[in-house]
């Protein structure tokens, strides 16, 4: 246990994480993170699961948010926009979507590169998950900084 | 000592910051930043040193945040996207990026405005500050309320 | 009074906030929110008034967002850049602008998309009221996700 | 590639003062970290004080940080220290170390020899008693 699940006492501990973009080869439009860099993680009332979903166990108000920095162009991506989606999955229940954001692609060339920010206060449930979506995966830039997710307990 | 001080207690007093961007003639990437209009400087757990960077006292996590409106024009500027960068110094330690954002230019005349927003959760150490760094400093706007940066522990 | 009310106590309650866009046809600049969806009211310290403004009992501080997608085109639009700001209104004095991001219109067709994110840390008095204002409310997206506003008291 | 360049080294007389210089060139030194280090005869190189790429902020060993004061002018691409009060221990060549700024090594510490990318030949102090 850390430091920083003491310092509210053990009925409150402070519960907060701060994940790292990480490409992937997979063929899913849902973005992989990692704790590697710059991360958090303030204890185990916070997972990443499966490199994907951020998991609490706790219920509570969560202030949520992730950033994602993308590089597209107009000609070679679909007419449809660049897309992010802060996601919920909460035991028993369907996914269903929080917080998104919509960037028409840029005409720039090759691709110019656009940041994208989401965030807001929900409550979670014991055991509920966090991901987020993307359009086009292939378009995220993954250099140091530019794309993020995490969450703090209120 | 203000009120923020005492609402927790001694022991664990509210600690936040905003401050609002200040044009400067310095040749210099570093936004500068000054305590004016609606700001917040809790108390003197935080500080806003040299105009550019907020500086804590104590260890611990903390939500920091940066709001950066600029304004550029593609055949102005220099083929790089506009990017804003998050930066910590922590005593001892070197300078290191924790969030970054890209913007390619815009194409409207004589400038396109665009906005960036960074936020994210970091622990940082007593001593440790926090600065904005942007590509081009002399496009970014300075109205009320356009770009802004700060903190708030945990 | 709701399980966020007692989980710091009576004394100092967890306040927090999230609503989510309504269309609306009245032809004013203020966008209009609801209780509705995915949505966060803590308890009755926070309130949605008319459906515009979030407005909080207690004094103190608060880190305060919203996020604003909108479709728009260069041709179809003023030449000035779409502005969402962040407003406050306090008892016994002027309606102010805390926060202001801007986006110059897309050159897509019929519009382009994009989002605006705002957060910052004010202080609110007893009675106060947040609000969002933008340039031209009828280009605002109110799909599920794209435009929310909220607050939570530190 | 940057070069380094140290000049200003010499004798001088225990309490006397001299101010060492570093002259960088290639890509602009602005994204750098800077950093004096300095070698004793027979012992290992030791860090003296860091200076950071875009705040400026320093860092100094706790022994010397009473009489040494280190700075960077950006427009001239060099370092500077400023070296007060010297002492017989002093004696030493002084070393000029730089790092990118976008560097990720091993080592994230400024007074450690191995985060460093480039460094110059040295210049040498001696100080008489």
């Known amino acids: 246990e850390n430091s920083f699940e003491m310092q509210k006492g053990d009925q409150n501990p402070q519960i907060a994480a701060h994940v790292i973009s990480e490409a992937s080869s997979k063929t899913t439009s849902v973005l992989q993170w990692a704790e590697k860099g710059y991360y958090t993680m303030s204890n185990n009332l916070v997972t990443l699961e499966n490199g994907k979903q951020l998991t609490v166990k706790r219920q509570g108000l969560y202030y949520i948010y992730a950033q994602v920095t993308f590089c597209s162009n107009r000609e070679a991506s679909s007419q449809a926009p660049f897309i992010a989606s802060l996601c919920l999955k909460s035991p028993g229940r369907f996914e269903r979507i929080l917080l998104r954001a919509a960037n028409t692609h840029s005409s720039a060339k090759p691709c110019g590169q656009q940041s994208i920010h989401l965030g807001g206060v929900f409550e979670l449930q014991p055991g509920a998950s966090v991901f987020v979506n993307v359009t086009d995966p292939s378009q995220v830039s993954h250099g140091t900084g530019f794309t993020s997710f995490g969450l703090l307990k209120l | 000592e203000n009120s923020f001080e005492m609402q927790k207690g001694d022991q664990n007093p509210q600690i936040a910051a905003h401050v609002i961007s200040e044009a400067s003639s310095k040749t210099t990437s570093v936004l500068q930043w000054a305590e004016k209009g609606y700001y917040t400087m809790s108390n003197n757990l935080v500080t806003l040193e040299n105009g550019k960077q907020l500086t804590v006292k104590r260890q611990g996590l903390y939500y920091i945040y940066a709001q950066v409106t600029f304004c550029s024009n593609r055949e102005a500027s220099s083929q790089a996207p506009f990017i804003a960068s998050l930066c910590l110094k922590s005593p001892g330690r070197f300078e290191r990026i924790l969030l970054r954002a890209a913007n390619t230019h815009s194409s409207a005349k004589p400038c396109g405005q665009q906005s960036i927003h960074l936020g994210g959760v970091f622990e940082l150490q007593p001593g440790a500050s926090v600065f904005v760094n942007v590509t081009d400093p002399s496009q970014v706007s300075h109205g009320t309320g356009f770009t802004s940066f700060g903190l708030l522990k945990l | 009074e709701n399980s966020f009310e007692m989980q710091k106590g009576d004394q100092n309650p967890q306040i927090a906030a999230h609503v989510i866009s309504e269309a609306s046809s009245k032809t004013t600049s203020v966008l209009q929110w609801a209780e509705k969806g995915y949505y966060t009211m803590s308890n009755n310290l926070v309130t949605l008034e008319n459906g515009k403004q979030l407005t909080v009992k207690r004094q103190g501080l608060y880190y305060i967002y919203a996020q604003v997608t909108f479709c728009s085109n260069r041709e179809a639009s003023s030449q000035a850049p779409f502005i969402a700001s962040l407003c406050l209104k306090s008892p016994g004095r002027f309606e102010r602008i805390l926060l202001r991001a801007a986006n110059t219109h897309s050159s897509a067709k019929p519009c382009g998309q994009q989002s605006i994110h705002l957060g910052g840390v004010f202080e609110l008095q007893p009675g106060a009221s947040v609000f969002v204002n933008v340039t031209d409310p009828s280009q605002v997206s109110h799909g599920t996700g794209f435009t929310s506003f909220g607050l939570l008291k530190l | 590639e940057v070069q380094l360049v140290e000049s200003g080294g010499g004798l001088v007389q225990a309490g006397g003062s001299l101010r060492l210089s570093c002259a960088a060139s290639?890509?602009?030194?602005?994204?750098?970290?800077m950093a004096w280090f300095r070698q004793a005869p027979g012992k290992e190189r030791e860090f003296v004080a860091a200076?950071?790429?875009?705040?400026?902020?320093?860092d100094y060993s706790d022994s010397l940080k009473d009489r040494f004061t280190i700075s960077r002018d950006n427009a001239k691409a060099t370092l500077y220290l400023r070296m007060n009060n010297l002492k017989p221990e002093d004696t030493a060549v002084y070393y000029c170390?730089?790092?990118?700024?976008?560097?990720?090594?091993?080592?994230?510490?400024?007074?450690?020899?191995?985060?460093?990318?480039?460094w110059g030949q040295g210049t040498l102090v001696t100080v008489s008693s």
């Open positions: 290639g890509r602009t030194p602005l994204n750098y970290h």
């Open positions: 200076i950071s790429s875009l705040l400026g902020s320093t």
């Open positions: 170390a730089a790092r990118e700024t976008t560097h990720y090594s091993t080592s994230d510490r400024v007074n450690e020899m191995r985060a460093y990318d480039y």
